[in-house]
Interface confidence: medium
């Protein structure tokens, strides 16, 4: 297993929608075909797996039906966005990638992405 | 089809800790926030708490802080509703019900609801 | 903290007849959190509308929901014998406060 370094903002906002997106760069030391971007969060020292895709090099990331992700690469880019988050999701947002192929095996973890959710007052009469 | 499964009947003392379990298929457990209701004999419905299965993350009403615990667990679909020094006021149905969600976006409402877990707190 | 009062308690009625439910909330509340379920006895409640006047999947076009503000209505058209149930109404104002009213039976007469 070799380091690589991964690169993602220290703090983003989410919107009032509860949808926040940040960019995860990583600087990849050879010509990757396949890549595994996984974000966790980190709150009250613990890990937890939000969400991981799979992708080859120029297709679009491929999250799980139904997943609270969703993003899109652009070579050593990865676009992520979390939609549904409310104020008790509010944490630090690692971004976690993995070069699968070809060998050899590269890992790299963010710092993280501090995530504040505020939970909006509802609006008389607003809309979803 | 989505289905919520809790688990049984119980019957605790005064002072006791009752953990109830509620398992969740027919969708992607952790992209729907699950909430915990309770409803004593012939009352009404009461909001307890949330959870969110993706981070684990919880809120709870401020009735029950500090005596209400919500986890999860991911690799077998599973929401669990813990709550402590029982007494006999919280005599009830306890349901799990997940949250309405549409294009992403969470609705606070809840679509799906189990037949629900009867607790009974008595000495 | 909003407060959700319904009225009438009871309300009975034949069915072919035309039910009208009211919820009342203490402030103002966004129709946009705003919804109605149905619990038959030893059963979970039922989504019937949200929004306030969006319909729930499977829902029949009987059921219908309207209001704004601080006044809400459920309206059913003609009462179907399966219809005669108690009725809440719920709304959201943050992470911690998802409160409901106290219900409504609907009754046969």
């Known amino acids: 297993c070799k380091a690589m370094h991964v690169a993602q903002p220290a703090v983003v906002l989410a919107s009032s929608r509860g949808i926040a997106s940040f960019v995860c760069e990583y600087a990849s030391p050879g010509k990757a075909t396949e890549v595994r971007v996984t974000v966790l969060r980190q709150a009250d020292s613990q890990v937890t797996e939000v969400c991981a895709a799979t992708y080859m090099m120029g297709n679009e990331l491929t999250f799980l039906d139904d997943s609270i992700c969703t993003g899109t690469s652009s070579g050593n880019q990865v676009n992520l966005t979390i939609q549904g988050l409310r104020a008790m999701d509010t944490g630090l947002y690692i971004c976690k990638v993995e070069l699968m192929y070809p060998p050899p095996y590269y890992l790299g973890i963010g710092n993280g992405t501090q995530i504040y959710v505020i939970d909006p007052e509802p609006c008389p009469d607003s809309d979803f | 089809q989505v289905q919520l499964v809790q688990s049984g009947a119980e019957v605790k003392k005064p002072g006791a800790s009752v953990k109830v379990s509620c398992k969740a298929s027919?969708?992607?457990?952790?992209?729907?926030?699950m909430h915990w209701v309770r409803q004593a004999p012939g009352q009404g419905l009461e909001w307890m708490g949330i959870?969110?299965?993706?981070?684990?993350?919880?809120s709870y009403a401020q009735k029950f802080q500090g005596r209400v615990t919500m986890t999860r667990d991911t690799s077998t679909s599973t929401v669990y509703m813990e709550l402590s020094s029982l007494r006999s006021e919280d005599t009830a149905v306890y349901y799990c019900?997940?949250?309405?969600?549409?294009?992403?976006?969470?609705?606070?409402?809840?679509?799906?609801w189990d037949q629900g877990t009867l607790v009974t707190v008595s000495s | 903290e909003i407060v959700l009062t319904q009225s009438p308690g009871t309300l009975s009625l034949s069915p072919g007849e035309r039910a009208t439910l009211s919820c009342r909330a203490s402030?103002?509340?966004?129709?946009?959190?705003l919804a109605w379920y149905q619990q038959k006895p030893g059963q979970a409640p039922r989504l019937l509308i949200y929004?306030?006047?969006s319909r729930a999947t499977g829902i029949p076009d009987r059921f219908s929901g309207s209001g704004s503000g601080t006044d809400f209505t459920l309206t059913i058209s003609r009462l179907e014998p399966e219809d005669f149930a108690v009725y809440y109404c719920?709304?959201?104002?943050?992470?911690?406060?998802?409160?409901f009213g106290q219900g409504t039976k609907l009754e046969i007469k």
């Open positions: 959870i969110n299965p993706s981070v684990g993350s919880t």
């Open positions: 929004g306030a006047s």
């Open positions: 019900a997940r949250e309405v969600r549409v294009r992403g976006v969470i609705i606070p409402f809840f679509d799906y």
């Open positions: 719920q709304q959201y104002g943050s992470s911690t406060m998802y409160t």
């Open positions: 402030q103002s509340v966004s129709s946009s959190y």
């Open positions: 027919g969708y992607t457990f952790t992209s729907y926030y």
